[in-house]
Each structure stands twice: as C-alpha cells, then as structure tokens.
Amino acid sequence: GCLTQLYENAFFRGGDVASMYTPNAQYCQMRCTFHPRCLLFSFLPASSINDMEKRFGCFLKDSVTGTLPKVHRTGAVSGHSLKQCGHQISACHRDIYKGVDMRGVNFNVSKVSSVEECQKRCTSNIRCQFFSYATQTFHKAEYRNNCLLKYSPGGTPTAIKVLSNVESGFSLKPCALSEIGCHMNIFQHLAFSDVDVARVLTPDAFVCRTICTYHPNCLFFTFYTNVWKIESQRNVCLLKTSESGTPSSSTPQENTISGYSLLTCKRTLPEPCHSKIYPGVDFGGEELNVTFVKGVNVCQETCTKMIRCQFFTYSLLPEDCKEEKCKCFLRLSMDGSPTRIAYGTQGSSGYSLRLCNTGDNSVCTTKTSTRIVGGTNSSWGEWPWQVSLQVKLTAQRHLCGGSLIGHQWVLTAAHCFDGLPLQDVWRIYSGILNLSDITKDTPFSQIKEIIIHQNYKVSEGNHDIALIKLQAPLNYTEFQKPICLPSKGDTSTIYTNCWVTGWGFSKEKGEIQNILQKVNIPLVTNEECQKRYQDYKITQRMVCAGYKEGGKDACKGDSGGPLVCKHNGMWRLVGITSWGEGCARREQPGVYTKVAEYMDWILEKTQSSDGKAQMQSPA
C-alpha cells in the first residue's frame, strides 16, 4: 500500500539503483516515485555531511522484500516511493530554494525582477528543466537579477551548491502550467529525425507518448509499429530531442508513428500510467511472481497491488489454466518497459496502475462567518482541493469554501447551510482559480446529500462541520485533487507551515474576491486562544490560528474552506474555517473546526453502501 512516512536521521543501506542531486527530500521522493524500480530513497541534506560530493545526494533504492536495513545518520532523511499513493503522485514541484545554486547546462540568461518571473520563464521554455536566479543582493553586481535557464541529461542538477543570494527551482511544466501549449496530434507514417535520448519497447504510440511526456529530456518521439519491416525494431519507441525543441526534419515512413511530448500542455497532462489492456499480446520481462487469478482485470489489479510489478501477461493457454483461473505473470525490467513484445498469442498484457493519480475511490486521510484578509493571489493548481460552494436562487453567488477529500466528497462548515439546507440550490465548482471564469457553460457538481454533524446547532460555534456527497464522482487532475486528512486525534504533530485559502472578504466590511486568496497563518494554542475569547468556549474540537498583531485572517465567504498545514512535504487538512471575532483583528485569532477530532465521524459517514470506507488515514 501507500507509505508516506519519512524517517529522520536514517539512511537505507544497500539496494542502490540510481543516484542524483536534489534540493530536498520531497524532490528526491518524487524522483523515486517516477523511477521504474525505486521503492525507497535516502537523502543527505547539506547539513548532514561534510563530503561536498555527497551533499544534496538523493539515493534511489530497490529491495526484493520492499524494505532495507536503516542505519543512523544524523540529518539524513529516508522514505518510500509514492507509487500506489493515488492523487499524491505528481511530478509537479513548486518550491523555490533560497541560498542554493542548482548546476546544469546554462543555455539561456536574462535579467528579471523576481524569482517567480524566472520560474515562469523556465516553465515557458521548452528545454528548461530548472533554473537559478541571482537576487539583487548577490555579491557580484553584474550577475544580479540574472535568470539562468538550465537542463541536464537526467533532468536533475549535475551539482547543488550552497550560495548566498541565489534562489533555484524547477520548471512548472509538470504542473500543467506552461504557456507553450502542446501538439496533441499523432502523425501516422512519419518518422522524426534528431537525437535519440532513450529507446524503449511499447505496445502502441500512446504508451510511447506518455513515456516521452514523463522523460526529462524527451520532446518528441517516433514509434515503429509491430509490422515495421525490420523485425528487431518492431515496437521500438524512440524518445527524441533537438536543439530547437522541434524536429529538424521528418521523413514519410510506412508503419511509423510520431508525435510530441505533452508536458507543455496547459491545464491537463496525461496520467503517468497506462491503463489499456492489450489482447493477444505477451510482454516479456524478468519474472516477479506467477499467480492464478480469474480474468485479466484481476491480473492487472494483482500487478498494481504488488508494488515492484511493472507489467503483466495473463495467459489463456489451456496448460496455464485451472477451472476459471489462469496464470497471471507479474513482470519487471530495468526501465519499466517490456524487454520483448510478442503478438498473436493467447495472452493479454498490460501495465501496473501503481502510478495512476486517480487511485481507487479512497482518500488520503493521513461565531461570525469568516474570509481572507491580508492575503495574496494564489496560482493555478496551488490548492487543488479548494472548492467554491455557490447558491443559485435568482442570481448565483459564492457563499462558502470547501475541501475536496474524495472523488465524491467535500468537507465544509455546517453553518454554510444555515437557512439553506436544500441541496438543489447549491452548485460546487472545483478546479477553479478565478470566480470570474465561471460562466453558464462552466461544469459544476451538484449535491446528492448534505450531512451536517448531528450535534451542530444553528448560530453556535460547536461541531461546525458538514460533509457533501456529490451526485457524480470527480476525476483528479493537477488542478482538482483531494487534500489528505489528518490521523484521528492528531495532537502530537507540531504544524509550523499553515495556510488558509478562500474567495472571502479582504476586509471586515468588504466583498467576495475574484482570485483565490492565500494567507500563511501560525497556529495558536487553545489555551492562548481561550484567553482572547472571554465569552466563548474554545474546545479541543477547535483549532485557532492568527497573528498577535492581526492583519491576516479568514473572513466572510471563506467559511467552510481549508486550513492546511504542510508537514514532511505533505499537505493535511487541519481545520475548517468556522468563526472569529470580526476579521484579522488584533489579538483575535480565527477559530477553525479541528478535523482530527472528527475523523471517526468522517469515516463513518463516508462508508460506501458496500461497507468499504472511502477515506483512509495514512499509516
């Protein structure tokens, strides 16, 4: 299953399959997730080691047993690949690293005014994988405000150096934020020229394209079909690049198919997995296991559940079958692709779905209405769980926020439904940033059921929590995916990086905002919070957040929205915006419903009809 925990001061011994330099453990974990054989990783931050060559070292590891011995190493961070972790699987990495220079091939230099602009330039440049920016205080005046766009053979820095007044980061193309746009066309009977960066075997051009999309240096590809004249080249997928970023020439060629990486697509990227099953095809590879199962779909499920399995063949040969069950061959290879593809067989083959974002139907659950004061604009895909709850009576208006916690579930505040309990009047918009983008043609979700906490009473601050079951399940994308829930009774975790988001008022007597606002707010202990509210009881089922001096807070219209905290690289829904004394007032923290205290209730209410929980807490 999905293992998200990180091990501090621990290093996995042995099992190395690859190594690289990464700026932090989270990026190392992402590289492990997308590496075909990596199950475990260990990362050495700069502070953990004197050897300059090993600083920022990211070591990707495999193990037949799924685990490796851990040795104590001060400062090291180790963990698991996020294969099988559904919506947590993403190649998108937004962080900016201050005081760090990520080295690579510098192919473009320009002057820009901010690191954000530099990241934008990288994202809008087809060859840029990462960048470094020299700030206005950089020691050499001639380099100040320089934005260096970079690439490397593996897509990761060739070295990482600690350097003051330099900021580095990665292209946001994997976040589906590129302005370049992409070519969706597949060109039949056409071969592209230029440099081959890799060669794999695939059953069709679509798998070839997805592999190209997630390969760090592939910009376009040519696929040779299974009837290509040279037998040894059949089903070969050639991943290609060029200096210009486009093919320098193309040749008409029977039984070839060419196309482009979809990494530069805006708003939608293909899933990093291949779900199609290929009848009459055998995939060859290293044998992992053989098991008897009933049907090819069960074979695929078995492969997906066995984390090391990359692809499978389900044999229908009489000698491979007993009663209704036949042999399911679970296989793997060095590069994640079959080592041989045979046609006209009595088998059916396909790939593990361990890297599919959608996962199953489960979710990672690892007094005045309130909005965002003192916040800043959010960007696309930054808070993909944020939804807008709107009411359509004569006019349509945004009333509350909410958090997507499953394909069919939204968590919000009970008080949002005070006086409006009718599900038909509500419209739920997900995957949006600007309210002004909503037109009559914008898709929305309707409510199947509103579940208000049984102990909630109108106009009281207690048990201010409600679940919304949507009429139809939502697909997950980079812009629309769930937030992890905390573990039940999560009291030991000290959260230091917490954010509140919403379209609510930007001042006490204000108006709904167009662009989703975000604000970084520190948590306040319940004891401190209680002192600030002389007449309201701050219970253990509440969590408070705010600045002593005020100025930043949630406000009217943010109610029901998320208070999320990042811990060990993972966002968790810590609170639901509930109430406060005015907005952003001095010494008056915002009060949020503490989600961890309601985990039993959430899990009970989200049980599906077959009794299978649709939410899971991380182990």
Partner: antibody
C-alpha cells in the same frame, strides 16, 4: 436572555457540607464553562474553580483544592458547588459565572453562613 | 501563582470628574487583565478585557491601559451609577483578583 439563577441562602454547622446550585437559562451549559467565585464579608473576590460541563473537566485554585467539588447536570442545565468540612472561614457569598476565557455573566450569589 | 496589588483600596471623587485605579501584577501577565464593577446584591459586571477592550454594552467613559506588570483603569465624566467596588482580574495564569477599590462620590 442569558441568566444564572443561584439557590437560596444556607445556614450550616461547622464540619458539615453544603451543595449550592446554579441553573442556567438562555444558553446550554455544555457550550460554556461555569466558574465559581467566593466573596467573604467585607473582603475581595477569590476564584475557586471552573468546570467544563461537557466533559466534567475541572480546574481549581491550588489553595482551594480538596475543599470544593464541582459537578454539572447537563439534562437540567445546572452546575453545582459542594463545600465540605465547613469552618467560619467558608462563610461567604458564592457566585457562579459563565464564560470562556473570563467570567462574562454572573449569578446573583448565594450566601453561606457557617455557625454553631 | 500570580498576586495582584490593587490601589487605592478606596477613593472619593466628584460627579463629572475622573478617577484612575492601578493594578500591579507579581509577574508579566501579557495584557491578560480584566476589570469588573461590583454593586451590592448582584454579581460583578465585566467592563474591560485584554487590558483595553471594552465589552459591547459598556460606555466609552471607561478605559484601560498598561502592559507587562503595570495596568490602570479610568472612569471619566463620573456619574452617580458608577458608585461601586471595582476589581482587576489577571487571567494569564489561572485567575487572581485584585483586592478591590471602593468608589464613592463626594
């Protein structure tokens, strides 16, 4: 309207115990804290303790510990203060109050006289 | 535990005048001080919390200030109904009242 109604005056003998009641109206005691405060004749106010009626959690002034017991009955929306082993030092007006971080609303007080 | 020293213990002032009461805490109480008005036969009434925040129904003639260990409370434009005993209360660490100040009108 928020109101706290306290039981009537009590005349008790030294060594005995007494139970004072504080009945709330206009709000649910589960949604607040109930505090108790003592005022001896011609003297100032002293905090005794507080109860969270939702879970019966209590907090006391360390000097009072053992003398007072706080309870609550959410079905009747009433909080109680029980005082044991009474001496003349316990002769006072006892107030109940509701609130969160502070005593925001007060009852009218109950006079307890300890006399042989 | 925190002690609160309130002074004066009594004072007399003229109608329309101004009075100031002070409270000194034995430790820094981080502005967590409240002021109450107490008249015989009823429970005390909360006037100010968090040093200077007036309760919603309290006239602006009442004010509070201070920080650290030293706090003060003032009533300006004195009216007959202001005759009462006034208490400070620290609520930074549990609760401690000051000794009280009895206000009389000359």
């Amino acid at each position: 309207e928020v109101q706290l109604h306290q039981s009537g005056a009590e005349l008790v003998k030294p060594g005995a115990s007494v139970r004072l009641s504080c009945t709330a109206s206009g709000f649910n005691i589960k949604d607040t804290y109930i505090f108790w405060v003592k005022q001896r004749p011609e003297q100032g106010l002293e905090w005794i303790g507080r109860i969270d009626p939702e879970n019966d959690n209590t907090k006391f002034d360390p000097k009072i510990q053992g003398k007072a017991t706080l309870t609550a009955d959410t079905s009747s929306n009433t909080a109680y203060l029980q005082l044991g082993s009474l001496t003349s030092e316990d002769s006072a007006i006892y107030y109940c109050a509701k609130g969160g971080g502070l005593f925001a609303y007060w009852g009218q007080g109950t006079l307890v006289s300890v006399s042989a | 535990d925190i002690q609160m020293t309130q002074s004066p213990s009594s004072l007399s002032a003229s109608l329309g005048g101004k009075v100031t009461i002070t409270c000194k805490a034995s430790h820094d109480i981080n502005k967590y001080i409240a002021w109450y008005q107490h008249k015989p036969g009823s429970g005390p009434r909360l006037l100010i919390h968090f040093t200077s925040t007036l309760q919603s129904d309290i006239p602006s003639r009442f004010s509070g200030s201070g920080s650290g260990r030293d706090y003060s409370f003032s009533i300006s434009n004195l009216e007959p109904e202001d005759i009462a005993t006034y208490y400070c209360l620290q609520y930074d660490n549990l609760f401690t009242f000051g000794g009280g100040t009895k206000l009389e009108i000359k």
